[in-house]
């Protein structure tokens, strides 16, 4: 398939050069119903013949299909065809391809490492606080409190496995019942989805990329929130997760298994352990009310220690305090007993940057948080850049077709389930749902994967992380085996229940619609993405936590009116869109409310004013800073060096005329030439992998 239209082609070729043709630009499947059509039988689209790339005729009067911002962009190849290259050019192109692949893998490696360090940073900053959340006695009686603690702790430590392991140790020490642990596990499931949402924020520079990336990331959030919304009340009423998992645990005579294989960690650990090493036990000890642990540092200093178990004589107030009568005596004055003590002798220090600094955990955490976010952002930008240059023409077509195309009729419905399995498998390999979904996010952003396809992959990722937990549970010591396995199974069945709720019937795939809605809002008002993150992962959980501490009467007193208002708004919204005639004229739209209650425009003005002071200081900043700047304020001309905001603003201004926005150009170089940014002569120097 020729990536460029042949100039000599007088006849229109519907297969090759038509916008919307199956081979060229797959359309997003219909949101409301599962498509059974194969690649060749897509919904009919308005066919516009694509004129040669130097023509601007196609910039005007776009067909309605292309106006859909969720359609994947076509990244056409702007390079010279392989057949047209001389030997030197072919060799050069081959090595360029190899170089790109090495760079891509390198940046991907540091991307995953930065996620690991980001988790460590969060644990250093909020780990002890997270541990203290667990020591709250109200968790036992209040499932809502358990849920928000699960969210907050997982957000604070950036690792659901850490919060889950704390819960497991608390259950096996009888500090927590399985019943009380289930809402915490549900919360941990929500909390873990913040990571890829943070990763999506890094793609804020390009509106359409950000729209897709943010929606792709938040589809995970919405799935988790909606699952909890339905399944937590069901669990509280029926205890079905507790009962099912208890039956499973009791029906099998499990033997201690092997540890879950650390596949990705094997590669990343050598690097991350040079940056920082943490003593994760400290958080668990704080959760278990160990007073001594509160003064311990999370930063691991000694990596090699010798533990010597010995018996020592210790005095006790009376013989009643003796470990056993046979190990008790008196010297005539004091009572003595034998106590088993473990002497820990430090042998070798750890080899990481912070080992000799003796900085407080908060300082180390803050440093690592900033650095890891910068590396994460930098790697993400580079991954997107490299992928953008590699995924063009036939490569893009093959990849996009492979990932986003359904099986032929009548097996189209199976595609999603295969994607769930792929997601689970990949997550099992990388041992982290955060890593998998975070790696998925830029691919959604640049348009390689549709949100419709990313959704089952994400659901699979949720399953994958629980299978890892089940394996880890099977490797637990005898006393913790039952509780850890039951909790891991609760996690597993919770996700299975969620999938059954929000996946099999296309109509119930609410998370996709909600994520797209949020994506659209966030693409228009980019500050809303940060607002969403703060509200959903911090403010709401903290508010519920605070109200729960005040007592159930306060919680109900505040919660019931809030829930009532939300239900009322949703019902009204549903009636407005489905059957507005049943409503009084005034209630048929939201115009009866003041503008600030029904639109983000006035809020946008407030945020823009508030962040106005940053705009002047933002000048001549690096691309990373520019992205952060664009996120806070839609600053139009602030980043002249990187031009990212400026380019976007020009594109926005141009949207009054029915001209293609840059993201809908079939060829990136056309859009640049049309806007006078890239000299036409440069457009042919690109080299593609094929």
């Amino acid at each position: 398939m020729a990536p460029w239209p042949e100039l000599g082609d007088a006849q229109p070729n519907p297969d090759k050069y038509l916008e919307g043709a199956a081979g060229q630009q797959p359309t997003a499947p219909d949101k409301s119903k599962e498509t059974n059509k194969t690649d060749n039988t897509e919904a009919p689209v308005t066919k516009i013949e694509l004129l040669p790339s130097y023509s601007t005729a196609t910039l005007i009067d776009e067909p309605t299909e292309v106006d859909d911002p969720w359609n994947l962009p076509t990244l056409q190849d702007s390079g010279i065809k392989w057949s047209e290259r001389d030997t030197k050019g072919k060799i050069l192109c081959f090595f360029q391809g190899i170089g790109r692949l090495i760079l891509l893998l390198g940046f991907l490696y540091f991307f995953v490492c930065s996620l690991d360090i980001l988790s460590s940073a969060f644990q250093l900053v909020g780990g002890k606080m997270a541990g203290q959340f667990f020591s709250n006695s109200s968790i036992m009686s209040n499932p809502l409190l358990g849920l928000v603690i699960g969210v907050l702790v997982t957000v604070l430590v950036q690792s659901s496995s850490t919060s889950t392991s704390i819960v497991v140790s608390m259950v096996s020490s009888s500090l927590l019942t399985v019943r009380a642990a289930i809402p915490i596990i549900m919360g941990a499931n929500i909390g873990t989805s913040i990571t890829n949402t943070i990763v999506a924020l890094m793609q804020v520079g390009d509106r359409s990329e950000f729209r897709r990336a943010f929606a792709g990331a938040t589809v995970h959030d919405f799935f988790n929130w909606l699952s909890v919304l339905v399944l937590l009340p069901v669990e509280v009423a029926t205890h079905y997760l507790e009962i099912i998992t208890q039956l499973i645990v009791e029906s099998f005579h499990f033997k201690n298994g092997e540890d879950a294989p650390d596949l990705l960690k094997v590669i990343t650990k050598p690097f991350t352990k040079l940056i920082v090493q943490l003593d994760k036990k400290v958080i668990s000890q704080i959760a278990m009310n160990d007073e001594k642990a509160k003064n311990k540092s999370l930063v691991k200093i000694w990596c090699k220690t010798f533990t010597n178990k010995t018996q020592i004589n210790v005095t006790v107030p009376s013989t009643a305090n003796c470990t056993s009568p046979s190990l008790c005596w008196t010297d005539g004055i004091q009572n003595w007993t034998m106590k088993n003590v473990t002497y820990k002798e430090n042998i070798a220090k750890c080899q990481h940057i912070f080992v000799n600094f003796h900085l407080p955990d908060l300082a180390v955490g803050t440093i690592l948080l900033i650095l890891s976010l910068l590396v994460l952002c930098g790697c993400l930008i580079m991954i997107v850049k490299i992928l953008g240059s590699v995924l063009k023409g036939q490569v893009a077509t093959v990849i996009k077709k492979t990932i986003n195309t359904d099986f032929p009729f009548p097996f189209a419905w199976l595609t999603g389930y295969l994607a769930i399995l792929v997601g689970a498998g990949m997550t099992f390999i990388v041992q982290s749902s955060s890593v998998f979904t975070s790696a998925l996010t830029p691919l959604i952003g640049i348009g390689v994967i549709t949100i419709e396809r990313a959704y089952p992959l994400t659901l699979g990722s949720n399953i994958g992380t629980t299978t890892t937990a089940i394996l880890a549970a099977l490797a637990s010591p005898g006393n913790a085996l039952r509780s850890s396995l039951q909790i891991a199974l609760c996690h597993f069945f919770f996700n299975i229940s969620g999938i059954l709720l929000w996946y099999p019937i296309p109509f119930t795939r609410l998370p996709i619609r909600m994520a797209k809605g949020l994506g659209n809002i966030s693409a228009k008002y980019r500050w809303f993405a940060v607002f969403y993150l703060i509200i959903f992962f911090f403010l709401i959980p903290l508010t519920v936590f605070g109200l729960s501490l005040a007592g159930w009467r306060v919680l109900v007193g505040v919660g019931v009116p809030v829930v009532f208002i939300i239900i009322l708004v949703l019902c009204l919204r549903l009636l407005q869109s489905r059957c507005p005639r049943v409503l009084p004229k005034k209630l048929q739209n939201w115009n009866f409310l003041p503008l600030w209650m029904r639109s983000l425009k006035p809020w946008d003005a407030v945020v823009s004013k508030f962040t106005g002071c940053f705009q002047m200081r933002c000048c001549c900043c690096c691309r990373v800073c520019c992205r952060a700047c664009c996120l806070l304020c839609d600053c139009p001309k602030c980043c002249r060096c990187s031009k990212c905001c400026e380019d976007l603003e020009e594109a926005q201004e141009g949207q009054d005329v029915p001209v293609k926005a840059p993201e809908t150009f079939d060829n990136i170089t056309i859009s640049r030439e049309a806007q006078g940014e890239v000299p036409a002569s440069d457009s042919k120097t690109e080299c593609t992998a094929l």
């Epitope: 013989t319 046979s326 008790c328 005596w329 008196t330 005539g332 004055i333």
Partner: antibody, heavy 119, light 107 residues
């Protein structure tokens, strides 16, 4: 070698007090407790109390509580036992003994001091 | 207080005999028991501590056993210098208490 040397025999009248000394040598005085045991003529051994020279802590048998006082002089490595309000039944040989290290057994004993209470 | 009861109170034996003295505690004392030997006109000497550990310089013919409430001192082959009174003592909990003693005489 470890030695505990007690003061000489005493003859006392009922109601009086007696103070028996026990000079130790051959070990670190403050490390081991000093016990006092008495033996009435033709009778068995009876523990009176003990003192820790290092801390000054004392412990007395209920029977002698309030009548016996145990003290030490670290400078001379000497332990003292004072028994007040003497009665005829207090006639006995009074032994000082070194306690085993952190034990209630007695590994080295003094030669004993005979205290006779008679009117 | 813990009572220590020794039996027998008197024991007649010949040189070379195997002699066993028993001591019974009124409650569990673990292994916190010591045995002493006292010859007439002399102060007591420690033989055994921790129910079975021989004190420095004590001949190997002396051995101790038992735990909980029942303890035994065994002289495997009685020697002329072994004719004396033997006391058991508990140091499980204060106050320290002794048995009433067992006098070993020449038959």
């Amino acid at each position: 070698q470890v030695q505990l040397v007690e003061s000489g025999a005493e003859v006392k009248q009922p109601g009086e007090s007696v103070k028996v000394s026990c000079k130790t040598s051959g070990y670190t005085f403050t490390t081991y407790n000093v016990h006092w045991v008495r033996q009435a003529p033709g009778q068995g051994l009876e523990w009176m109390g003990a003192i820790s020279p290092g801390s000054g802590l004392t412990s007395y048998a209920q029977k002698f509580q309030g009548r016996v006082t145990l003290t030490v002089d670290k400078s001379t490595s000497t332990a003292y036992m004072e028994l007040s309000s003497l009665r005829s039944e207090d006639t006995a040989v009074y032994y000082c003994a070194r306690g085993g290290f952190r034990l209630g057994s007695m590994d080295y004993w003094g030669q004993g001091t005979l205290v006779t209470v008679s009117s | 207080d813990i009572q220590m009861t020794q039996s027998p109170s008197f024991l007649s034996a010949s040189v070379g005999d195997r002699v066993t003295i028993t001591c019974s505690a009124s409650q569990n004392v673990g292994t916190s028991v010591a045995w002493y030997q006292q010859k007439p006109g002399q102060s007591p000497k420690e033989l055994i501590y921790w129910a079975s550990n021989r004190f420095t310089g004590v001949p190997s013919r002396f051995s101790g056993s038992g735990s909980g409430t029942d303890f035994t001192l065994t002289i495997s082959s009685l020697q002329p210098e072994d004719f004396a009174t033997y006391y058991c003592q508990q140091y499980s909990s204060p106050p320290l208490t002794f048995g009433q003693g067992t006098k070993v005489e020449i038959k």
